[in-house]
């Protein structure tokens, strides 16, 4: 039975040209995390593999940085970065846990972070 939950940074906003940290945290499970994938809609941004470390997708290397922790830092934000981001935790033996973050990149300087909140976990067995 999958007991884990993912906590994310939730709905967040940031200013154009700035940076933002995307964070997820998996709790309430003793499952071993084998890999975390970070995705933006239909593109894989980066992976952190327990054995092999961090790897950033070649098309994002210039403005995506690993961390802190299992999180991801997006730099030089543009309005095109607005949208959904997903952290996908591959675990053993549970399977896959997915967290969702919505980022809005604003033209003005009124951007502010949303509060952290719990989201229901989605899971798919491999």
């Amino acid at each position: 039975m999958m007991t884990g939950t993912i906590e994310t940074t939730g709905n967040i906003s940031a200013e154009k040209g700035g940076s933002i940290i995307l964070q997820c945290h998996l709790s309430s499970t003793t499952a071993q995390v084998t890999q975390v994938n970070w995705e933006q809609q239909d593109q894989l941004l980066a992976i952190c593999n327990a054995d092999l470390g961090w790897h950033i997708s070649p098309s994002f290397k210039d403005r995506v940085a690993p961390g802190p922790g299992l999180g991801l830092t997006l730099q030089s934000l543009t309005v095109n970065d607005t949208g959904e981001y997903f952290c996908i935790y591959h675990t053993y033996p549970d399977g896959t846990y997915t967290g969702r973050i919505f980022l809005e990149v604003l033209e003005s300087s009124v951007a502010e972070h949303g509060a952290r909140f719990q989201i229901p976990h989605h899971h798919h067995h491999h």
Partner: antibody, heavy 117, light 107 residues
Framework: EVQLVQSGAEVKKPGASVKVSCKAS????????IEWVRQAPGQRLEWMGV????????NYKEKFKGRVTITADKSSSTAYMELSSLRSEDTAVYYC??????????WGQGTTVTVSS | DIVMTQSPDSLAVSLGERATINCKAS??????VAWYQHKPGQSPKLLIY???YRYTGVPDRFSGSGSGTDFTLTISSLQAEDVAVYYC?????????FGGGTKVEIK
């Protein structure tokens, strides 16, 4: 120029072990993964495992766990793949490749391993 | 493990005509798919990475598309030197499984 040069062909008896080397040159050895892929006659390419030469971290396909060992010697920029308890089905061409995780951009020339009694 | 299923197994195309190869993943792999060309007696060569990015030096007649579970490699105008076996491979999670290959020949 990036190059991966593999050791020569091997003929082994069932139950024996084989160790294939892959010498890298033309790039920073510890900045890329080294992946191992094989192709048995008439079969698809099969991923076997990978090493991060910088950290020494390895990841193996489940079917090879306990039978394959991938290592890397940073001082000589050489990776090794050792496969034990050989059987006839292990007859294949074994390739090393430089990995960016998201793709394998340079490949060795391949090493033919024949397992026969 | 993620299973990559290629179709067709083989393809005969006239010189200058379009060749299309499909690859289906057994589960979501985002855009983490690469395509390789493998000629007899040679090592595989990278053509496409991240589903649609052409690798350095690869002719622009090769293109890739797709995301999620369905992917396509297209050779827009087949040349004699394109005769080979083509493989897709997923890099979404280990083990980095390959498709079964598609043999492309001249009709």
């Amino acid at each position: 120029e990036v190059q991966l040069v593999q050791s020569g062909a091997e003929v082994k008896k069932p139950g024996a072990s084989v160790k294939v080397s892959c010498k890298a040159s033309g790039y920073a050895f510890t900045n890329y993964l080294i992946e191992w892929v094989r192709q048995a006659p008439g079969q698809r390419l099969e991923w076997m495992g990978v090493i991060n030469p910088g950290s020494g971290g390895t990841n193996y396909k489940e079917k090879f766990k306990g039978r394959v060992t991938i290592t890397a010697d940073k001082s000589s920029s050489t990776a090794y793949m050792e496969l034990s308890s050989l059987r006839s089905e292990d007859t294949a061409v074994y390739y090393c490749a430089r990995g960016e995780y998201f793709f394998f951009d340079y490949w060795g020339q391949g090493t033919t391993v024949t397992v026969s009694s | 493990d993620i299973v990559m299923t290629q179709s067709p197994d083989s393809l005969a195309v006239s010189l200058g005509e379009r060749a299309t190869i499909n690859c289906k993943a057994s589960q979501h792999v985002s855009n983490a798919v690469a395509w390789y060309q493998h000629k007899p007696g040679q090592s595989p060569k990278l053509l496409i990475y991240s589903a649609s990015y052409r690798y350095t030096g690869v002719p622009d007649r090769f293109s890739g598309s797709g995301s999620g579970t369905d992917f396509t490699l297209t050779i827009s105008s087949l040349q004699a030197e394109d005769v080979a076996v083509y493989y897709c491979q997923q890099h979404y999670n280990t083990p980095h499984t390959f498709g079964g290959g598609t043999k492309v020949e001249i009709k």
